[in-house]
């Protein structure tokens, strides 16, 4: 019976300790209950031990026990020894439980402090979160306003761009018109001396002179009067330009040629001549133009196939194979005559295209333009 009770006490203790440790209910109440239960069990145990001791005394007194053998007495002594051992063990456990109780109290205090700190932190975090949410919503509002402003500005920019483009075009047209007028005036003045008179009367037929010694090939001379119209020959490849030779002795007058074909009647010569320099053949090279008596290059800004097309066709080629930028055929020397040239592709020569500016400083010879014409 005692053993059973003892077990139930232990189980109750275990439950109470578990409850204490898991922190069920109010902490201080639990401690009090724990102590009460513990003390109650201790006093019960003491009472039972006392009861056993009393019984032992009574048994010793009775005659019935005097007849008991020594072995029974020995056993009883053993039991007493065990009980005293158990008691001291229980006392030890009591001390341990006291220690645990103290630890639990201090742990409880620590947990309370921690809970308090967490609650404070929680409050602060909630406060901060609220503030941040407010700030974020304000920021979102600002971003929305800014993006709306940006959109409005973008629209305004597009309109402005279109207006500016229009104005720039108008300004370019004015500039071109002024240049054109200036050029027309200068041509008019220049051409006062260039007006072609009527052909003179035919001269008498002279004797054919011996052929003069031919010097090394020189630069092409001015175009002579047309001779007899021959059959059209196949186009030969132009030879490379030779060094100018010394002039040969003039021969006697040759026989009189047939009457030349009627000229176009145009007293103006084109103000630009074009040549291709530095290519693998006469059909390609850096584009150079003769302007104001000086050969110069064209900058590759806006240099595209339609401009190359005009250059090639003006040189007698059927079309353009490729246009080249960035001094593909080497850097030229002298002025960079043109910067931006705009052609639709069907103009008969580069001077017919839209030329923004003659004599540009916005480019360097590393940007010299070139073409490869189709053969």
């Amino acid at each position: 019976k005692w053993e059973t009770k003892n077990c139930s006490v232990s189980s109750t203790n275990a439950n109470d300790i578990t409850q204490s440790l898991t922190g069920k209910g109010n902490d201080s109440e639990e401690e009090m209950r724990f102590q009460e239960v513990f003390m109650e069990h201790m006093s019960n145990m003491e009472k039972r031990i006392q009861h056993i001791l009393d019984m032992e005394a009574n048994l010793m007194d009775t005659e019935h026990f005097q007849n008991f053998s020594m072995t029974t007495d020995q056993r009883f002594n053993d039991i007493l020894l065990q009980l005293s051992t158990l008691f001291s063990s229980v006392q030890g456990h009591g001390n341990a439980i006291d220690e645990i109780s103290k630890s639990l109290i201090s742990l409880n205090t620590t947990l309370l402090d921690l809970q308090l700190n967490i609650e404070n932190l929680n409050g602060k975090i909630q406060e901060n979160t609220f503030k941040q949410q407010e700030e974020i919503s304000k920021l979102e509002e600002r971003v929305y306003n800014v993006s709306a402003e940006i959109m409005a500005m973008k629209e305004e920019q597009v309109h402005l761009e279109q207006e500016i483009k229009g104005e720039v075009k108008v300004l370019n047209n004015i500039t071109n018109d002024l240049r054109l007028k200036d050029w027309e005036h200068s041509q008019t003045l220049r051409n006062i001396t260039l007006i072609q008179g009527p052909p003179g009367p035919p001269g008498e037929k002279g004797d054919r002179g011996p052929t003069g010694e031919s010097g090394p090939r020189g630069f092409p001379g001015p175009i002579g009067p047309p001779g007899l119209k021959g059959d059209r020959g196949a186009i030969g490849f132009p030879g490379s330009r030779g060094l100018p030779g010394y002039a040969g002795r003039p021969g006697n007058s040759g026989p009189k040629g047939q009457k030349g074909e009627k000229g176009s009647g145009n007293t103006l010569t084109p103000f630009t001549k074009v040549r291709l320099v530095g290519g693998s053949g006469p059909h390609e090279g850096r584009v150079e133009i003769l302007h104001s008596g000086q050969w110069g290059t064209i900058c590759d800004d806006r240099w595209e196939v339609r401009v190359g097309q005009v250059v090639c066709r003006s040189l007698g080629y059927p079309g353009v194979q490729a246009v080249h930028k960035a001094a593909h055929f080497g850097q030229g020397t002298g002025p960079i005559w043109l910067n931006e040239v705009f052609c639709f592709g069907r103009e008969s020569s580069i001077e017919e295209c839209k030329i923004r500016q003659w004599g540009t400083r916005a480019c360097s010879h590393s940007e010299d333009a070139g073409v490869t014409c189709t053969l």
């Epitope: 592709g345 069907r346 017919e352």
Partner: antibody, heavy 121, light 108 residues
């Protein structure tokens, strides 16, 4: 010598789209530019759009922006003009023309024969 | 956009007459003006470019003049093949290129 040959007449219902072609010969399409001009019955000439060398891109008249698309097919040297959301107001003869600079101004010296588009329900 | 206004809208004349058609721009267009002739069922044909330059292949009886805002096309002696509609066109401020509304030249 340039020649521009346009596709044949077409009839469309309101709201539909039409795509006209303009075949180039004498030059390749990369060597010239194509512009489009239309003429409503008994009315004047109205420029629609085309390649602008100064802009370096195809430009459109404000009236047609978003409704007209100009494209090119290099291999058959053919230019196309597509007009969408047709209304009876779009009934007209549509011309393709090739421009050049004439003393810095733009002039059209070669024109296609024109394509009549009739928009009717 | 620049507006181009032609006058008169229509005109009756006889073969041999001297005829003048005018074109006015809503703002100065310098000399960036071209003239075209169009016959019924045909595409327009370039006659004069840059206000006064005669397009190759066009008879010399056609001439153009003017600059700024006022321009004229003159046919010195009307021929039967000249009866057609005439349009002026500016390319000073582009896009867009704009045309006049046309002048119809009829036989009197």
């Amino acid at each position: 010598q340039v020649q521009l040959v346009q596709s044949g007449a077409e009839v469309r219902e309101p709201g539909a789209s039409v795509k006209l072609s303009c075949k180039v010969s004498g030059y390749t399409l990369t060597e010239l530019s194509i512009h489009w001009v239309r003429q409503a019955p008994g009315k004047g000439l109205e420029w629609m759009g085309g390649f602008d060398p100064e802009e370096g891109e195809t430009v459109y008249a404000q009236k047609f922006r978003g409704r007209v698309t100009l494209t090119e097919d290099i291999s058959p040297d053919t230019a196309y003009m597509e007009l969408s959301s047709l209304t009876s107001e779009d009934t007209a003869v549509y011309y393709c023309a090739t421009p050049r600079y004439c003393n810095n101004g733009i002039c059209y010296d070669y024109w296609g024969q024109g394509t009549l588009i009739t928009v009717s329900s | 956009d620049i507006q181009m206004t032609q006058s008169p809208s229509s005109l009756s004349a006889s073969v041999g007459d001297r005829v003048t058609i005018t074109c006015r721009a809503s703002q100065s267009i310098s000399s960036y003006l071209n003239w075209y002739q169009q016959k019924p069922g045909k595409a327009p044909k370039l006659l004069i470019y840059a206000a006064s330059s005669l397009q190759s292949g066009v008879p010399s009886r056609f001439s153009g003049s003017g600059s700024g805002t006022d321009f004229t096309l003159t046919i010195s002696s009307l021929q039967p093949e000249d009866f057609a509609t005439y349009y002026c066109q500016q390319s000073y401020s582009t896009p867009p290129i704009t045309f006049g509304q046309g002048t119809r030249l009829e036989i009197k």
